[in-house]
Interface confidence: low
Amino acid sequence: FEIALPRESNITVLIKLGTPTLLAKPCYIVISKRHITMLSIKSGERIVFTFSCQSPENHFVIEIQKNIDCMSGPCPFGEVQLQPSTSLLPTLNRTFIWDVKAHKSIGLELQFSIPRLRQIGPGESCPDGVTHSISGRIDATVVRIGTFCSNGTVSRIKMQEGVKMALHLPWFHPRNVSGFSIANRSSIKRLCIIESVFEGEGSATLMSANYPEGFPEDELMTWQFVVPAHLRASVSFLNFNLSNCERKEERVEYYIPGSTTNPEVFKLEDKQPGNMAGNFNLSLQGCDQDAQSPGILRLQFQVLVQHPQNESNKIYVVDLSNERAMSLTIEPRPVKQSRKFVPGCFVCLESRTCSSNLTLTSGSKHKISFLCDDLTRLWMNVEKTISCTDHRYCQRKSYSLQVPSDILHLPVELHDFSWKLLVPKDRLSLVLVPAQKLQQHTHEKPCNTSFSYLVASAIPSQDLYFGSFCPGGSIKQIQVKQNISVTLRTFAPSFQQEASRQGLTVSFIPYFKEEGVFTVTPDTKSKVYLRTPNWDRGLPSLTSVSWNISVPRDQVACLTFFKERSGVVCQTGRAFMIIQEQRTRAEEIFSLDEDVLPKPSFHHHSFWVNISNCSPTSGKQLDLLFSVTLTPRTVDLT
């Protein structure tokens, strides 16, 4: 190989050992029969050399550094050449470095021809191995602007006071052009400006200077985004850290087209703007840091550009001004992430603050819109608390548990509407009365409606789930001892059509000691399946529940248990079941931890089933499933 560097070229070539490999055989640079491991060639020198091995690319790397001095004379602006030409260089991993020094008052602009650049984060690499590392200067300090691959959106980077650009090419890469040019600009009065051009839908991830280390103190960095007017851009922060500021405040500023309040100032922890049409700028401003404990400012963010969706021009008013203690969240439904570009799906407040989820609270009217290709990617979850603090005021008071029509009119599917019903301890209890009698969801008779009510205790220490109930059954009412949550959960978009079937009234009633009482009025010829609360985990210790089962005058009820033994093993206390005829008060008592469960029994009058648990040993829980079937009394039961 022969490398000759012209005089005054300000080029230095360095061939040195790369990352040590585990190759057994060493390799040397051979010059005049001398074996060396490092070779430096300066301007005006001509050197002939060879290597002592067949694959020098496994051992050596080459760095070609060109110093460009814009301080003492005119600057060589324009397209930057690869000198010496790659065809004259040995096939080693090579890094071309251009080090441009300029006055503070001079702006320097790197312009990248197509393909533009894509910034990568720490630890990431470029698929083709070609990387661009760009750094600037603040006085004597080097500042890393970033590392970039090809095929991105970054078209120009403006800096002042100097720039160092390193282009790394793997030994096998055929590239023979630098792919960028340098132009002079007036002072930019900040650390740098990065221009990112979108020609269609896509996304770009960008980082503050020095990322993941700290952004230089009290500096300003700007990103300019060029976005076709027919597309919309949204910004989301992937990761950020704030430093400890002594003076000023760290912030981001946006210049947004059409905004009357430019610049719009946001804290880094704020939701960032979305649904922006056309070009916009984003600037990161640091602060004066605490000398003792500076901390670090750093930011990694994503800009997502996509077509405005049909829904993005529609404004929906969600009027929660008459509601109390209620919050509505619109959020992405969990899905498996696909590898290809997926347009963002955002919900926007006042058409400007867009994010992947949004929570609206009661007491106000909210205007929302959507920036989303497919609204089925979102769903709504609502929580409302109805509480009674004064038992004298609340007793016998009733509330309708209905989903407000404003919410049903939104173009997003309702997932859960949860009512938290709170009562004063040991003073009041609750009764739930459905508009349509309810069926308890069981494996034997599952609900197939578009929605169900999930009823559970709302006492933090109590793990008690009463069950899932849907319209179209025999449960007339459910009485519960204390705080519960009732969640209307939808299972199909057809809930919109079936919404009229929802309707549950809750009333505050005098306190009673049992955990729950189910009032069941079976319909003739239908089999009613009932099961104890907490089916999968077992009825909680020392808990008692009852079923009040009505039997019409001309009918007889068959009560059937679905296993021979309850399976419960008591650690302390006894588990028992009482079946009591309501008319005669005659009762049968069964010890659930000892006796076999009763065989099918026939009841001519309304009766109670009461089940009370002991403190069971772990793993031996109390779970019972039983059914009630009505048949006309005229049938011969023998």
Partner: antibody, heavy 119, light 107 residues
């Protein structure tokens, strides 16, 4: 107090699938990322991947792409790890752990779920 | 990916002695390094975050130092309950990696 409670041990045959759950309580699931770490018997810790609990987007380490799926059900504050086409070398304790941002430290861990794959 | 190498693999000390555990990264990771303790049959426990920041509830005898590629976990005076395996973890970039662990055992 913050707790991550994982589902119980599983004994599976090669080729079967398993789904491990991790229920979060004592904090809001969507405020923190959820990470999964594997520890084969007598071995060290291996980071498998994480799931962004706000968006549901998973990220996997290279060795865990393909047969491993991370998912969430925010309504029950639960994260899931599903492994399909189980192999004997999948025998390990799988931990879920709570992380912060994109440079996490794992401040709370589940108790671990032992998955044994044996014919 | 970042490779973390812990040394020594095993450290045998008596209670009251000073323990110094080392973790070296294959490239500079700034201060994106955390330390964990794991006792047999238990989940790991976070001891130190970001190379040197202490964690509330962790005894003051545990401290961390280092930046770039060389890191140290120090236990100023080892207590009987400190005998366990210690792991360092890089949180610099995906994939996050753990060191192979250092076992601190009773001499």
């Amino acid at each position: 107090q913050v707790q991550l409670v994982q589902s119980g041990s599983e004994l599976k045959k090669p080729g079967e699938s398993v789904k491990v759950s991790c229920k979060a309580s004592g904090y809001t699931l969507t405020d923190f990322s959820m990470h999964w770490v594997r520890q084969a018997p007598g071995q060290g810790l291996e980071w498998m991947g994480w799931i962004n609990t706000e968006t549901g987007a998973p990220t996997y380490a290279d060795d865990f792409k393909g047969r491993f799926v991370l998912s969430l059900d925010t309504s029950v504050s639960t994260a899931y790890l599903q492994i399909s086409s189980l192999k004997s070398e999948d025998t390990a304790v799988y931990y879920c752990s709570r992380g912060r941002d994109y440079d996490p430290h794992f401040d709370y861990w589940g108790q671990g779920t032992l998955v044994t794959v044996s014919s | 990916e970042i490779v973390l190498t812990q040394s020594p693999a095993t450290l045998s000390l008596s209670p009251g002695e000073r323990a110094t555990l080392s973790c070296r990264a294959s490239q500079s990771i700034s201060d994106f390094l955390h330390w964990y303790q794991q006792k047999p049959g238990q989940s790991p426990r976070l001891l130190i975050k970001y190379a040197s920041q202490s964690i509330s509830g962790i005894p003051a005898r545990f401290s961390g130092s280092g930046s770039g590629s060389d890191f140290t976990l120090t236990i100023s005076s080892v207590e009987p309950e400190d005998f366990a395996v210690y792991y360092c973890q890089s949180a610099h970039s995906f994939p996050y990696t753990f060191g192979q662990g250092t076992k601190l055992e009773i001499k």
